[in-house]
């Protein structure tokens, strides 16, 4: 027989399996080119003086052999007499020390037995029900695979695992996930359902961080609001270094833990962008708005546990900075402009209600008017601040409204909405005798008094119905009582009260008639 052919004769040794524990095993055969094939196997035991023979039986029942000598790998062509298009049964017989040792048989169609590629390119790693899920695109035109993985941690050797059969354009594997240590994974594939097919090489390492990314130690402090309407957020952190398995040291793609600072500006919900994520370590400047700040540690699986802080709004108010004029067409606010081409966010919310009920309006970028003021107007029909109640107003400004960290606070103040003149009219005005020539007038607090800084004063008016003389008495906004003296017994008087703001004169209450009875001596 020619060495390049499978010899259809009896092999040159007796046919008897010694049944020993040593011998050939793990036979793998595959196609290596259009017309060539290769079989390889392992040999367990002393190798001195061992001769290997690759045996092949065709579906017709005819059998042949290739003599491999001491080699454990053998190549042959499609012209070697082995039927490659049809199923054949192959095994190895090793002749040593006057005995024959046989490997387990493999039955396969050599023509289709190609060595698969390992997972190539991007292996996506995610977490699924406490396990690790790896997913990759099946290498083109190699659908139908068995997949294995091996994994190790910085302190443990490789452990082998099975991903099970795969039969789709994407393949996946569920693997164990470690809570607190990084792991290195590698994957390999072989043809599904083909006995004796060869495993691919191992894939490049897939480095996987622990399920729980280490938490940073963070402390925040917020400075006072400066003249520019901004305050600095400062923080400190000590990131933890992760110990990595051997194949992940150096670059270690996949095991990185990143710490990010997520700012959520709670105020001014009508602006374009409410959240901004920054690298931890940058020191952002904030407006006087309320913020939620989170430090998010994340790894390949996405965010881990985060630490969240609430930064309350700076509630320092400047009641004089805002000028409000109410006209027949609507209401206009004026305030000192910040700079050229500024966008302003005017936010208002009824006092005493949840912050979630804040309403706001964003102005188009505007330049200061000749008086250096910025303005915002609204009509009565718009319904803005139309209810007769106290509103807390904050105005924010930004030259770049799309950038969350560039907003500043212009002012915060209170405003009474709707028809403040009428709504502020004091009710329940009552008059009580105080002495022979004086009375005590008191009233229920004006609704304007619920609005800090809005009520400038009360004015009490007393009119002598006989002489038509009128006297007016200013009363502090914190008081709801005044004593009128110098009155004459038997004269009819009417008393009225009104509540004034810095910009508006109030509406008089209903006239209250009274007189001091003439005292008759016995």
């Amino acid at each position: 027989c020619r060495t390049s052919e499978c010899c259809f004769q009896d092999p040159p040794y007796p046919d008897a399996d010694s049944g020993s524990a040593s011998g050939p095993r793990d036979l793998r055969c595959y196609r290596i080119s259009s017309d060539r094939y290769e079989c390889s196997w392992q040999y367990e035991g002393p190798t001195a003086g061992v001769s290997h023979f690759l045996r092949c039986c065709l579906s017709s029942g005819r059998c042949c052999y290739f003599a491999a000598g001491s080699a454990t790998r053998l190549q042959f062509s499609d012209q070697a007499g082995v039927s490659v298009l049809y199923t054949v049964t192959l095994w190895v017989e090793s002749w040593a020390r006057n005995q024959t040792e046989k490997s387990p048989e493999v039955t396969l169609q050599l023509y289709n037995s190609v060595k698969y590629e390992p997972p190539l390119g991007d292996i996506k790693v995610s977490k699924l029900a406490g396990q690790l899920r790896m997913e990759w695109e099946t290498p083109d035109n190699q659908v139908g695979a068995e997949v294995q993985f091996r994994h190790r941690t910085p302190s443990s050797p490789w452990k082998l695992g099975d991903c099970g059969p795969q039969d789709d354009d994407t393949e996946s594997c569920l693997c164990p996930l470690e809570m607190n240590v990084a792991q290195e994974f590698q994957l390999r594939r072989r043809q599904l359902g083909s006995q004796g097919s060869s495993w691919s090489k191992w894939s490049s390492p897939v480095c996987v961080p622990p399920e729980n990314p280490p938490q940073p130690q963070v402390r925040f402090s917020v400075e006072q609001l400066g003249q520019d309407g901004r305050r600095r957020l400062t923080l400190k952190e000590q990131p933890t270094q992760l110990e990595l398995p051997e194949g992940c040291q150096g670059l270690a793609p996949g095991t990185e833990v990143t710490y990010r600072l997520q700012l959520h500006m709670l105020s001014c919900p009508c602006k374009a962008k409410a959240t901004r994520t920054l690298h931890l370590g940058k020191m952002p400047y904030l407006s006087g708005a309320a913020y939620n700040v989170a430090v998010i540690s994340s790894n390949q699986f996405g965010p881990g546990l985060n630490q969240t802080w609430h930064i309350p709004a700076d509630t320092h108010t400047e009641p004089v900075a805002l000028n409000i004029s109410v006209g027949t067409n609507g209401t206009t606010m004026y305030w000192p402009a910040r700079a050229q081409s500024m966008t302003y966010c005017i936010e208002w919310q009824p006092v005493g209600q949840d912050g979630g009920l804040a309403t706001c309006s964003l102005t188009a970028p505007q330049d200061p008017d000749p008086a250096g003021m910025a303005t915002y107007s609204w009509s009565r029909e718009s319904g803005a601040m139309g209810q007769e109640k106290c509103y807390y107003i904050t105005i924010f400004a930004s030259a770049h409204p799309e950038k969350l960290t560039l907003w500043s606070t212009v002012l915060s103040t209170y405003h009474f909405g709707g028809n403040a003149s009428a709504a502020g009219t004091p009710h329940h005005v009552s008059v009580k005798n105080h002495s022979l020539d004086s009375v005590s007038v008191d009233w229920a607090p004006s609704l304007l008094s619920t609005c800090p800084g809005v009520l400038k004063e009360y004015v009490v008016r007393c009119r002598d119905e006989d002489s038509k003389q009128v006297s007016e008495h200013p009363v502090q906004p914190t008081e709801t009582q005044v004593t009128l003296s110098g009155l004459r017994a038997g004269v009819a008087y009417t008393v009225q009260v009104r509540a004034d703001t810095a910009w508006l004169r109030g509406v008089w209450s209903q006239p209250q008639r009274f007189s001091i009875e003439v005292q008759v001596s016995d």
Epitope: S33, Q109, V114
Partner: nanobody
């Protein structure tokens, strides 16, 4: 699903050359191999050859060995297989069909191993 469309057929003189193309679209990553078959009136469809796509390994029927060459080109979501036919003979006159299989146990000489087929293109070799 996989769609196959052949092109390039026509009339050619004996000894001449022709190149057929077969464009596969659809779920092409799942295709294991693509082959060429031919059929003349009143006869069974016979294998011309096949290419295993992931490796480029080819098989040829004895009647075309040395004259015909199968190759393939991969693009995004499409695979094009070519059949370069040289030294054409009158017995090569037939309708040529492109086929694709998704299983790893297929025998390239058997038509029933292929799940997908093209509509065919006529090749006529005249003397």
């Amino acid at each position: 699903e996989v769609q196959l469309v052949e092109s390039g057929g026509g009339l050619v003189q004996t000894g001449g050359s022709l190149r057929l193309s077969c464009a596969a679209s659809g779920r092409t990553p799942s295709i294991v191999a693509m082959g060429w078959f031919r059929q003349t009136p009143g006869k069974e469809r016979e294998s011309v050859g096949e290419i295993i796509l992931s490796k480029g390994f080819t098989y040829y029927a004895d009647s075309v060995k040395g004259r015909f060459t199968i190759s393939r080109a991969n693009a995004k979501n499409t695979i094009t297989m070519y059949l370069q036919m040289n030294s054409l003979k009158s017995e090569d006159t037939a309708v040529y069909y492109c086929a694709a299989r998704q299983n790893w146990s297929g025998n390239p000489t058997r038509t029933n191993e292929y799940e997908y087929w093209g509509q065919g293109t006529q090749v006529t070799v005249s003397s």
